[in-house]
Interface confidence: low
């Protein structure tokens, strides 16, 4: 697999992926207890015909081109979690494993 | 998770897996032995904020707004793989199991 | 040898209960849709419902609230709880395989058991 | 829920004639349609899958065609172990909640 990276000083219009430092503290979200702040990346970009297709079903599907089938957009293709401690509804500390917090690579599906 | 399915006649305008069967004798795709045909659905429809939401991560995107990033849009969340038996470059038979041919679920990311 | 075989049939009083079972041997229960279909003497064939991939069970509007599909994939069975039987579900009650086109389960069905008989009657 | 509705009820042919069957769903059900073929005391065949693809092990004078909500089993050289009856079969959209069975088409041999 394989995806772009791009920065903001980056040209390139294709589907890539994007820094993006996500802050809990600047949205107010004051139940996170740690980390206050973390590397979360984005995906943006266009996709045009087979570039960066994740799956081959979204080849298929451009093939037989059903009614109302949007081309392909970029989206995340591979994510991984991160540990955080925070406050649930009851006010008890927890501490565990996010799921897709982080986007690794981004695609076109 | 969850994820609405739908048919051609549905007015259902959000996010929404449709059924789709791929021929690929249609496509003129030879060296594919088998299956002929298989279901391999698509996903279409539109993402409104929080709807099918797939990842905390798309909500902290849209909370976070960076330059460039697009809403979430209508792609597959689940899928799953078909055997198949194809030719491949060399002209040799080959069975194999091909990843994320089928769309099982779809959802905002 | 791949094979279903139904059991657990035979003659039951209205308001009854039964659990029929199938036992499936030659491949593995889990990856594949499992139905249950009926025939009633003389009659075509009815569906019942469906365990599918991931355990979760459909059902025929007739057959919700009183028909429970269930398996057990340690003893690779699948079964069928009938209650509050009636004369009417008197049938040749069939368990199916979902059809493997070549690694997806259908929902339709290429492997079927004999049939076991209900007779609901007092 | 999606209805099958065949016909004709019962056919009556001669040894090497053409059959064709008709089934008709109540909306479309674009390609999600089989044919079973069943003799007394024993339990269904699958024939047909997807509309138009011939199940393992069948001969190939079964035919299945149609899309939508029109289809056709035909039989293009009727043989006397064809005689049985034919049930079609959908299984309700991509949402597989619902599996619906036509009534059946009875095939004599003259």
């Known amino acids: 697999d394989f995806g772009l990276d791009c920065d903001e000083h980056s040209t390139e219009s294709r589907c890539c992926r994007y820094p993006l430092t996500v802050d809990f503290e600047a949205f107010g979200w004051d139940w996170i207890i740690a980390p206050k702040r973390y590397k979360a990346n984005y995906c943006s970009g266009e996709c045009e015909f087979v570039f960066l297709q994740k799956y081959p079903h979204t080849h298929l599907v451009h093939q037989a081109n059903p009614r109302g089938s949007a081309g392909p957009c970029c989206t995340p293709t591979k994510m991984s979690p991160i540990n955080m401690l925070y406050f649930n509804g009851k006010e008890q500390i927890i501490y565990g494993k996010i799921p897709a917090m982080v986007v690794d690579r981004c695609g076109c599906s | 998770d969850f994820g609405l399915d739908c048919d051609e006649h549905s007015t259902e305008s959000r996010c929404c897996r449709y059924p789709l069967t791929v021929d690929f004798e249609a496509f003129g795709w030879d060296w594919i032995i088998a299956p002929k045909r298989y279901k391999a659905n698509y996903c279409s429809g539109e993402c409104e904020f929080v709807f099918l939401q797939k990842y905390p991560h798309t909500h902290l995107v849209h909370q976070a707004n960076p330059r460039g990033s697009a809403g979430p849009c209508c792609t597959p969340t689940k899928m799953s793989p078909i055997n198949m038996l194809y030719f491949n470059g060399k002209e040799q038979i080959i069975y194999g199991k091909i990843p994320a041919m089928v769309v099982d679920r779809c959802g905002c990311s | 040898e791949v094979q279903l075989v139904e059991s657990g049939g035979g003659l039951v009083q209205p308001g009854g209960s039964l659990r029929l079972s199938c036992a499936v041997s030659g491949f593995t229960l889990s990856h594949y849709v499992k139905g249950w279909v009926r025939q009633a003497p003389g009659k075509g064939l009815e569906w019942i419902g469906i365990?599918?991939?991931?355990?979760?069970?459909y059902y025929a509007s007739w057959a919700k609230g009183r028909f429970t599909i269930s398996r057990d994939n340690s003893k690779n069975t699948v079964y069928l709880q009938m209650n509050s039987l009636r004369a009417e579900d008197t049938a040749v009650y069939f368990c199916a395989r979902g059809h493997d086109n070549f690694g997806y389960s259908y929902h339709d069905f290429n492997l079927w058991g004999q049939g076991t008989l209900v007779t609901v009657s007092s | 829920a999606v209805v099958m509705t065949q016909s004709p009820a019962t056919l009556s042919l001669s040894p090497g004639e053409r059959v064709t069957l008709s089934c008709q769903a109540s909306?479309?059900?674009?390609?999600?349609l089989s044919w079973y073929q069943q003799k007394p005391g024993q339990p269904p065949k699958l024939l047909i899958y997807l509309a138009s693809t011939l199940a393992s092990g069948v001969p190939s004078r079964f035919k299945g065609s149609g899309s939508g909500t029109d289809f056709t089993l035909t039989i293009s050289s009727l043989q006397p172990e064809d005689a049985a009856t034919y049930y079609c079969?959908?299984?309700?959209?991509?949402?597989?909640?619902?599996?619906?069975f036509g009534q059946g088409t009875k095939v004599e041999i003259k």
């Open positions: 365990i599918n991939i991931e355990g979760e069970t």
């Open positions: 079969q959908t299984y309700d959209g991509i949402s597989h909640y619902g599996v619906a």
């Open positions: 909306e479309s059900i674009h390609h999600e």
